[in-house]
């Protein structure tokens, strides 16, 4: 199996097992109850059969209990994300027990060896949960296992081995290598808890996928398609994260799942919504912004429990940093005629004007091609809440921005030197907001002028019958 290039550490020659010394190495798992929001505090260590620490450290038997499970490590120390997550859980659920599962000695190994250790760590967690269940008032239903990377599969094993069913498992970019395509009992799967929700942020269809691509939960959420995360490009990393290397890009994208979850804990007033869709391409086309029949959900901690017959893949766009929430819009543009389009696809931009704010100029991504006498659907998203939309400016970019388009223009010119003006006719744009589920129709300001050509713009205002609101549920109403 391939060894990934450092999903939770730096890319260097640290993949060997630590050198053995005369000290006996205990291949054990520790449970650290984080008793304080202060990340420096040493916390309390819990062990099966020892009730005193539960009393000394005020373990709350009736409260929610979170187990945070780290993944593979190249450094042998806790990654910095862990303290953020602990703090966020304490902030959101003040009475909850937050337990860090420390399996560093077993994770600080060759990746393949760490993978082989996940089962034994899962067993240790299950034993701890079985022991806690013997206590009065402790309920497995209140247990929420949160596993990052390899830790997500550890959570799966724990959920599989425990006597009973844990309430919830959240998989934060579950590890891909050695788990992709594996049997359900050898990876995180929906039967490991009453509710299994998963965030996928580093999946790749080419090369090595650090995160698992396949759906493994009741709901599997793929922010930004589950691959390229905004703010994690090499340029972004050079400027902000420790140092700009490919490894840091990997780390940034893989770890983004943790930050999206933290965001859902600390910014509950700015929830991000994901929409069910069969694949990323269809989502990019703007086809999947429905909230009917549980087709949308909050992401992260606020996700509503959905136990579907089959895995539900959900998608959303995000900002580059916290708060990650964006506002999604489906734009349906009916092109009823066009002239002399040639080989090249037009490059369109829209600017949305609302009661609260105006958007930036947003590109319309043409996933396939512009169809004539058909409704073309696009996805656009804004970082700010525009309020109610008032008008839309549609611009057809003039000069070609890519060498490829320039070449195609040149070829078109050679074959058709007189090249009469390219033109496209659009009468109306239908807009649906993902977040409010409201639908609006916008008509050209001048009903006589419906044509647009390169370098020109067309303005649309709400049609007279404009404020059509379908009987669909708004996700904002459904927050827990």
């Amino acid at each position: 199996s391939p060894v990934p290039f450092g999903p939770e550490g730096r890319l260097e020659d640290k993949l060997h097992k630590p050198k053995a010394t005369q000290t006996e190495v205990k291949p054990s798992v520790r449970f650290n109850l984080r008793t304080s929001k202060d990340p420096e505090h040493e916390g309390c260590y819990l062990s099966v059969g020892h009730s005193q620490p539960l009393e000394d450290c005020s373990f709350n038997m009736t409260a929610k209990t979170f187990f945070i499970i780290h993944g593979w490590t190249m450094s042998g120390i806790f990654e910095n994300w862990l303290h953020k997550l602990v703090s966020a859980l304490h902030t959101r659920e003040k009475d909850a027990n937050v337990v860090v599962v420390d399996w560093l000695p077993l994770a600080h190994q060759l990746y393949t060896d760490a993978v082989n250790n996940t089962r034994v760590v899962g067993h240790s967690i299950a034993r701890m949960l079985d022991w806690l269940q013997e206590k009065d008032d402790f309920s497995l239903g209140n247990v929420h296992l949160i596993g990052y990377s390899l830790g997500a599969h550890v959570a799966g094993y724990a959920g599989n081995f425990v006597k009973g069913t844990v309430g919830r498992i959240t998989g934060l970019d579950p590890a891909g290598p050695m788990f992709e395509g594996a049997d359900i009992h050898k990876r995180l799967s929906p039967d490991d808890a009453d509710f299994v929700d998963v965030l996928h942020t580093y999946t790749r269809s080419f090369g090595l996928s650090i995160g698992i691509q396949m759906p493994v939960g009741h709901i599997d959420i793929y922010p930004n398609g589950g691959d390229f995360q905004p703010g994690c490009g090499l340029n972004d990393v050079l400027g902000s994260i420790a140092y700009g290397t490919i490894t840091e890009v990997v780390k940034c994208e893989h770890e983004r799942a943790v930050h999206l979850f933290v965001d859902s804990l600390v910014n509950q007033d700015k929830p991000s919504f994901a929409f069910q869709c069969t694949d990323s391409n269809r989502f990019k086309k703007g086809i999947c912004l429905s909230c009917r029949k549980n087709r949308c959900n909050s992401i992260g901690y606020n996700a509503k429990k959905m136990r579907n017959k089959r895995n539900s893949k959900m998608y959303l766009k995000t900002r580059a940093g916290m708060p990650f929430r964006v506002y999604h819009y489906q734009m349906k543009i009916h092109v009823f005629s066009y002239k002399n389009m040639g080989e090249i696809e037009p490059t369109f931009y829209v600017t949305l004007y609302g009661t609260n704010a105006d958007s930036q100029t947003l590109p319309l991504e043409i996933v396939e091609r512009i169809e004539q006498n058909a409704t073309n659907t696009f996805l656009v998203y804004t970082e700010e809440d525009l309020g109610d939309l008032l008008k839309i400016q549609l611009t057809w970019e003039g000069a070609s921005q890519s060498w490829y388009n320039l070449w195609k223009e040149f070829r078109s010119y050679l074959s058709q030197p007189r090249n009469p003006g390219r033109e496209l006719n659009i009468r109306r744009i239908r807009v649906k907001s993902g977040e409010t589920q409201r639908k609006l129709t916008f008509c050209t300001e001048d009903p006589e002028n419906t044509s647009i050509s390169p370098g020109r713009e067309l303005w649309f205002r709400k049609c007279r019958d404009g404020w059509r609101m379908k009987n669909e549920t708004s996700p904002t109403v459904e927050l827990p």
Epitope: P27, R34, P39, H41, G76, F78, L82, L104, I241, A242
Partner: antibody
Framework: QVQLVQSGAEVKKPGASVKVSCKAS????????MNWVRQAPGQGLEWMGW????????TYAGDFKGRFTFTLDTSTSTAYMELSSLRSEDTAVYYC?????????????WGKGTTVTVSS | DIQLTQSPSSLSASVGDRVTITCKAS??????????MHWYQQKPGKAPKLLIY???NLASGVPSRFSGSGSGTDFTLTISSLQPEDFATYYC?????????FGGGTKVEIK
């Protein structure tokens, strides 16, 4: 109170070995990692590595792989740093310092240091 | 590894002076809103002592004339009114990643 007590100064010949001890008291030994820091005469501080006091797994910094060995005796809450095949450039003060497993991992408690002199 | 460059390497000051020492990291030592930068004081023949942790937090028992500031790659240690016992060498340290590294030190001497 929390303290780290290190063994006394050592004078060794080149090629010999030395074992420096660091005994912890006033806290739960296994709840903090133990680090080793070297300071050559008139020079700055150099991190040598650390040992996980619970698992016994040592980690060595790049320049300290090979001749250096970190070990533990958890029954006496003592960490050891052994250096073999001594050279004159190993002459330095060696400090042990604890750091938490959680949070920002600064070195909040230091031993007084053990001076190792390598001279023929 | 992250390099830390301290300046000045030495300075002469009088009791009561305001002293500022800077530490520049070769890359950011911030993680989210936390800075993994710390300051230590070392007197001749003694072990280093933690002064400031996480850029601006005063360690237990450290006088309030010491303060730290900064984020990203640029950090400052300030002694608002230098006292006789403050003549020592000061080191910055980053712990955002292993190996933790120290700056070269700034020696504060009596003018």
């Amino acid at each position: 109170q929390v303290q780290l007590v290190q063994s006394g100064a050592e004078v060794k010949k080149p090629g010999a070995s030395v074992k420096v001890s660091c005994k912890a008291s006033g806290y739960t030994f296994t709840n903090y990692g133990m680090n080793w820091v070297r300071q050559a005469p008139g020079q700055g501080l150099e991190w040598m590595g650390w040992i996980n006091t619970y698992s016994g797994v040592p980690t060595y910094a790049g320049d300290f792989k090979g001749r250096f060995t970190f070990t533990l005796d958890t029954s006496t809450s003592t960490a050891y740093m052994e250096l073999s095949s001594l050279r004159s450039e190993d002459t330095a003060v060696y400090y042990c310092a604890r750091r938490g497993y959680y949070g920002r991992r600064y070195f909040d408690v230091w031993g007084k240091g053990t001076t190792v002199t390598v001279s023929s | 590894d992250i390099q830390l460059t301290q300046s000045p390497s030495s300075l002469s000051a009088s009791v009561g002076d305001r002293v500022t020492i800077t530490c520049k990291a070769s890359q950011s030592v911030d993680y989210d809103v936390d800075s993994y930068m710390h300051w230590y004081q070392q007197k001749p023949g003694k072990a280093p002592k933690l002064l400031i942790y996480a850029a601006s937090n005063l360690a237990s028992g450290v006088p309030s004339r010491f303060s730290g500031s900064g984020s990203g790659t640029d950090f400052t240690l300030t002694i608002s009114s230098l006292q006789p016992e403050d003549f020592a060498t000061y080191y910055c340290q980053q712990t955002i990643e292993d190996p933790p590294t120290f700056g070269g030190g700034t020696k504060v001497e009596i003018k």
